[in-house]
Interface confidence: low
Amino acid sequence: MEDEKPKVNPKLYMCVCEGLSCGNEDHCEGQQCFSSLSINDGFHVYQKGCFQVYEQGKMTCKTPPSPGQAVECCQGDWCNRNITAQLPTKGKSFPGTQNFHLE
């Protein structure tokens, strides 16, 4: 038989979710998955999740990395599982910062 698609809505991907916005969940469904890193009060804050509306993700995902924030986006089930966003270094270090993973 042909590999026909199921009847269910095909546009969502399952994404790893990590961070305060995830509550007790460790996954979410969205039209894009993301992995982000930002610096808040000297801490490296890592987050992962999903953009449930494509336009919302399109804006954020196209933002080039800055010294204070980076977002990487992808489309595919759990595609953000092994993605860790990186801040642009350009030889510049951030003294006194610590890795701090928000769960």
Epitope: P6, V8, N9, V53
Partner: antibody
């Protein structure tokens, strides 16, 4: 994350209409099919039907004549109505969001039909 | 599409390998999910697309199969795995579930 909260009358008499509502929080209402599933005490799961944000519905053929699912996108809510209930409709009713699996569920509402 | 699940109940010891099977009445490709339901709780999605584990679900749970024959395995049964397990297809409408398999610990 997507959270579903449901409510409605828990005790009905035969021939009455079952009415339940489910509110959706923290989710893209247009991204999911919104479903109702029921489970008679001690028994398995039965899919009742679904609706999307446009109001397009699909029902279980075994219940088509009695079941209506509606949506209120302004409130991010969807509702179930089941007419002419009998004791056989006694069950826990769940609202749930479906894409490729029922990943998010309401807490369940026990509906008892008894004279 | 009818989903036939077996056995309807089983009893096993902690650490045992437990396998549940689900058979579809027609080819459903890999559009099959497995759920765990504990008493008084809503079902929880464990595996989707026949073999993909939902993150956060312990790796002792696994699923295999395609077409009409599917299986679900707990590689080493733990006390917290006591529950009823259901398969469900989403190939077509109506969406249907298997009859469930209740897993108990052998004393």
């Amino acid at each position: 994350q997507v959270q579903l909260q449901q409510w409605g009358a828990g005790l009905l008499k035969p021939s009455e209409t079952l009415s339940l509502t489910c509110a959706v929080y923290n989710g893209s209402f247009s991204s999911y099919y919104w479903n109702w599933i029921r489970q008679p005490p001690g028994k398995g799961l039965e899919w009742l039907g679904e609706i999307n944000h446009r109001g397009s519905t699909n029902y279980n053929p075994s219940l088509t004549s009695r079941v209506t699912i509606s949506v209120d996108t302004s409130k991010n809510q969807f509702s179930l109505k089941l007419t002419s209930v009998t004791a056989a409709d006694t069950a826990i009713y769940y609202c749930t969001a479906h894409t490729r699996g029922f990943l998010y569920w309401g807490q369940g509402t026990l509906v008892t039909v008894s004279s | 599409i009818q989903m036939t699940q077996s056995p309807s109940s089983l009893s096993a010891s902690v650490g045992d390998r437990v396998t549940i099977t689900c058979q579809a009445s027609q080819d459903i490709n890999n559009y099959l999910n497995w759920y765990q339901q504990k008493p008084g709780k809503a079902p929880k999605l464990l595996i989707y697309d026949a073999s993909n584990l939902v993150p956060g679900v312990p790796s002792r749970f696994s699923g295999t199969g395609s077409g009409t024959d599917f299986s679900f395995t707990i590689s080493s049964l733990q006390p917290e795995d006591i529950a009823t397990y259901y398969c469900q297809h989403y190939y077509d409408l109506p969406l249907t579930f298997g009859g469930g398999t209740t897993v108990a610990i052998r004393r």
